[in-house]
Amino acid sequence: GDMLIEKTIKREVVLEEGTTAFKNWVKTGTTVYRQFWIFDVQNPDDVAKNSSKIKVKQRGPYTYRVRYLAKENITQDPEDHTVSFVQPNGAIFEPSLSVGTEDDNFTVLNLAVAAAPHIYQNSFVQVVLNSLIKKSKSSMFQTRSLKELLWGYKDPFLSLVPYPISTTVGVFYPYNDTVDGVYKVFNGKDNISKVAIIESYKGKRNLSYWPSYCDMINGTDAASFPPFVEKSRTLRFFSSDICRSIYAVFGSEIDLKGIPVYRFVLPANAFASPLQNPDNHCFCTEKVISNNCTSYGVLDIGKCKEGKPVYISLPHFLHASPDVSEPIEGLHPNEDEHRTYLDVEPITGFTLQFAKRLQVNILVKPARKIEALKNLKRPYIVPILWLNETGTIGDEKAEMFKTQVTGKIK
């Protein structure tokens, strides 16, 4: 009995034409939503003039349907038992699941003004940029619609820059009509314990963003894991959104629509400083903003974002050090709302429900040569938005899953 089930599972989780896993893998049967909350700045002038604390008020959710497109360019390699693919990106606004429209306006940090002196640290270039910032009437903060902020707008200051640079700015620009990948993952045909584990990403086994082992691409993409998951196992996965591999540990057993699943959670020590978790030393790549690598809860992903000062954290700076959140007022971190978890069915290793939560922040520093930033007396890691990407197995799929998998085992 058990041997037969194990054999069936091993056959059905292989990523090749005709298996249950493959069909769901090519195009997820789960509806995935990405909710956004935007941090609306309440005191922009006070901050720019007096370097006050930034008062923010989150507004949302604004919901989009994502991950509805099938994987493309799927190519099996029988030689090394891998399958390669790209994951197309797309987002469709869902007005009925949102508090407003894509035209709602927000006061947020001026992304281009904040990034320019960080990217161009040469003072002469900054003097030139300052004249263009003034000419374009740009300042430290700006008012932008949701659509502009997320998906891109033509920046008036960058449009004046006399050498060829991209003049379109957006937190997720470009997104629609782009792809993530190429991913090359093990199909599990020769070794089921390697199924879905990423062999390479964009043709490389390392990211080239981090020193040492932090640069490794570990585990799967979190949509599934090798079968027969034990509670003691650490689930490793790579997230291109945060430009790194990360891990989840067992949290609790949960009943999901009659299916017993293991809830794996991202532990606080994944975001700890090297002082608290020495394994994280290679995620600390600069000494100033990190207070000599003692700050925690924020990840500088600038190297992965063409040098832009982008920092990733958990929403509301959950699990972040006080020095990070101190200059910001209006944040209320909450473990239940703001943590990331994966609900994994242990026999198949399939993730049947998940909530990926992250916050996008931009570093803005005093810049002597940029008038809009020269009154700042300290650097700020400014929250722009946080997102909650969720997916849950549908009722029909859950019934089918119970019949075919968990039912048989009982």
Partner: antibody, heavy 122, light 107 residues
Framework: EVQLQQSGPELVKPGASVKISCKTS????????MHWVKQSHGKSLEWIGG????????AYNQKFKNKATLTVDISSNTAYMALRSLASDDSAVYYC???????????????WGQGTLVTVSA | ETTVTQSPASLSVATGEKVTIRCITS??????MNWYQQRPGEPPNLLIS???TLRPGVPSRFSSSGYGTDFVFTIENTLSEDVADYYC?????????FGSGTRLEIK
């Protein structure tokens, strides 16, 4: 040791053009800004413009916008200034001057070439 | 364009005396003022950079002060080797502009 070596003196006719060079050594060329400064005989200094070799970005004093063109050749660590439609009031010593900012305060025009005398005469 | 007015145009002092040169700008430039020395037949030499910062290797008898629009450059205990033209340069905004210069002579 940082050195900026400028090309020799030029005697040119009114209406003609001239191209002055400034060869650098002793530092990473792309990391330093290069400026050009004019000094007419017995007079003060005037900033003509600057170029950032890293990305070729330039900025000019409007007064010299139609007079000077700044370029660089990264392969030879050399900066150039071309002057066109020369007239007698363009007769001057022209200096190249570079500066480096990373983590060293804000020192402008730290290193200077020896100057190139351009004489415009019929 | 920020205009820089430098005074005096020339001055003559005995060695050991104090020299004061003043530059006034037409716009507020914070402390983005620089000071140069140009000896005869040589290119200018940066003595003091923005923020009244004395450059490495420059003798401590040279100093500057000022913020906004009014700036002063001082030489304490002038030496004969200080004979030169002195220029101020504002580096706050484009185009960068120099003062008209001050010629220092020794009596």
């Amino acid at each position: 040791e940082v050195q900026l070596q400028q090309s020799g003196p030029e005697l040119v006719k009114p209406g003609a053009s001239v191209k002055i060079s400034c060869k650098t050594s002793g530092y990473t060329f792309t990391e330093y800004t290069m400026h050009w400064v004019k000094q007419s005989h017995g007079k003060s200094l005037e900033w003509i413009g600057g170029i950032y070799p890293y990305n070729g970005g330039t900025a000019y004093n409007q007064k010299f916008k139609n007079k000077a063109t700044l370029t660089v050749d990264i392969s030879s660590n050399t900066a150039y200034m071309a002057l066109r439609s020369l007239a007698s009031d363009d007769s001057a010593v022209y200096y190249c001057a570079s500066d480096y900012f990373y983590g060293d305060g804000y020192p402008w025009f730290t290193y200077w070439g020896q100057g190139t005398l351009v004489t415009v005469s019929a | 364009e920020t205009t820089v007015t430098q005074s005096p145009a020339s001055l003559s002092v005995a060695t050991g005396e104090k020299v004061t040169i003043r530059c006034i700008t037409s716009t507020d430039i914070d402390d983005d003022m620089n000071w140069y020395q140009q000896r005869p037949g040589e290119p200018p030499n940066l003595l003091i950079s923005e923020g009244n910062t004395l450059r490495p290797g420059v003798p401590s008898r040279f100093s500057s002060s000022g913020y906004g629009t009014d700036f002063v450059f001082t030489i304490e205990n002038t030496l004969s080797e200080d004979v030169a033209d002195y220029y101020c340069l504002q580096s706050d905004n484009l185009p960068f502009t120099f003062g008209s210069g001050t010629r220092l002579e020794i009596k």
